[in-house]
């Protein structure tokens, strides 16, 4: 978990301090002079003790990923498509997602993390099957796979964080145009 510190790496702080501070939750994110900082709630401390800490000092990728994903969901809900996560289409036919019957050898081919490859980057995402999936590009492979976001959050949180950081516009509170940017064709 992340440790509480001021401008020092985790290892340095642990050498200097007996007490270990554990991050309970990531509450917010900001950019100061080009550096990403997160607002942290510390386990066992009140909200008055919440602090902004530089991203590079933190060791809680799972909590950061959780925060970023919650922001993505909020960001989508806030968009002006009637305030809904999905556009106002008819309810989707979830039954259609049962995989078509494929050749035996094709269906036995390992997919996703089962391929044992190192994730390189996320090149897209979709919730069209009812579950958030990331399109994952792997190192030393041209073949990408759709993988469950919840699995990626655990297995490669840094890749997930990078994806969200590139894809979301933070703390530039939307102008009217930004607010409507996903509504026009």
């Amino acid at each position: 978990m992340g440790k509480k510190q001021n401008k020092k790496k985790v290892e340095e702080v642990l050498e200097e301090e007996e007490e270990e501070y554990v991050v309970e939750k990531v509450l917010d994110r900001r950019v100061v002079k080009g550096k990403v900082e997160y607002l942290l709630k510390w386990k066992g401390f009140s909200d008055e003790d919440n602090t902004w800490e530089p991203e590079e000092n933190l060791d809680c990728p799972d909590l950061i990923a959780e925060f970023l994903q919650s922001q993505k969901t909020a960001h989508e809900t806030d968009k002006s498509e009637g305030g809904k996560r999905k556009a106002d289409s008819d309810s989707e036919d979830k039954g259609e997602e049962s995989k078509p019957k494929k050749k035996k050898e094709e269906s036995e081919k390992p997919r996703g993390f089962a391929r044992g490859l190192e994730p390189e980057r996320i090149i897209g995402a979709t919730d069209s099957s009812g579950e958030l999936m990331f399109l994952m590009k792997w190192k030393n492979s041209d073949e990408a796979d759709l993988v469950p976001a919840k699995e990626a959050n655990v297995k490669c949180p840094q890749v997930v964080i990078s994806f969200y950081e590139e894809r979301l516009t933070w703390h530039s509170y939307p102008s009217e145009d930004d607010d409507k940017k996903d509504d026009k064709n």
Epitope: D93, A125, T126, T169
Partner: antibody, heavy 121, light 111 residues
Framework: AVQLVQSGAEVKKPGESLRISCKGS????????ISWVRQMPGKGLEWMGR????????NYSPSFQGHVTISADKSISTAYLQWSSLKTSDTAMYYC??????????????WGQGTLVTVSS | ASALTQPASVSGSPGQSITISCTGT?????????VSWYQQHPGKAPKLMIY???KRPSGVSNRFSGSKSGNTASLTISGLQAEDEADYYC???????????FGGGTKLTVL
């Protein structure tokens, strides 16, 4: 408002090089992929490839890989499609397009007005 | 991957419903619920009508709906109107090597 403004029509000779552009405005340019789509005269749409302007990572359709180069200059919010040696068969309307959502995989909701490229000897 | 298969033309009278099919393979339409549909009027840029199988962008009439069964996706337009006359293209994610593939297009005529 989201806008993709493409460069003007071009008339070229076979063997010449060309670069056409697509300038994005009204949104965070580096947060959205830019795709290029070809439409030959009287024909359908063909997906050529796309670029992530944040780091210039690209995906190409096998049909276009090696024939064109997609690039971007995020400092001026502009994506490019270029040819080093044009053929008469490159005559077409070329559209740049951007997805509705930052993370969309294979759909595009905002389109440029198109750039007509004519290659003729 | 070769283009998705669409009928060359479809027609209907005002007020009627029509369906345009888009047939792919288990490598594209069948594997992913990532089909989008575009409307293109002559001399204009395409317009997104449906994405991710059945989602409608804001501003698109609810007369347009999308669905999928097996390797075939469908666009249904109910209550046909004169302004619906246009070319319609489907497009699907087709795996990371091909990425996206369009259908050949369908000309819709409103009689």
């Amino acid at each position: 408002a989201v806008q993709l403004v493409q460069s003007g029509a071009e008339v070229k000779k076979p063997g010449e090089s060309l670069r056409i552009s697509c300038k994005g405005s009204g949104y965070s340019f580096t947060s959205y992929w830019i795709s290029w789509v070809r439409q030959m005269p009287g024909k359908g749409l063909e997906w050529m490839g796309r670029i992530d302007p944040s780091d210039s990572y690209t995906n190409y359709s096998p049909s276009f890989q090696g024939h064109v180069t997609i690039s971007a200059d995020k400092s001026i919010s502009t994506a490019y499609l270029q040819w080093s040696s044009l053929k008469t068969s490159d005559t077409a309307m070329y559209y740049c397009a951007r997805p509705l959502q930052t993370y969309s995989i294979a759909s595009v909701g905002h389109w440029g007005q198109g750039t007509l490229v004519t290659v003729s000897s | 991957a070769s283009a998705l298969t669409q009928p060359a033309s479809v027609s209907g009278s005002p007020g009627q419903s029509i369906t345009i099919s888009c047939t792919g393979t288990s490598s594209d339409v069948g594997s992913y619920n990532l089909v989008s549909w575009y409307q293109q009027h002559p001399g204009k840029a395409p317009k997104l009508m449906i994405y991710e199988g059945s989602k409608r962008p804001s501003g698109v009439s609810n007369r347009f709906s999308g669905s999928k069964s097996g390797n075939t996706a469908s666009l249904t337009i109910s209550g046909l109107q004169a302004e619906d006359e246009a070319d319609y293209y489907c497009c699907s994610y087709a795996g990371s090597s091909t990425f996206a593939v369009f259908g050949g297009g369908t000309k819709l005529t409103v009689l």
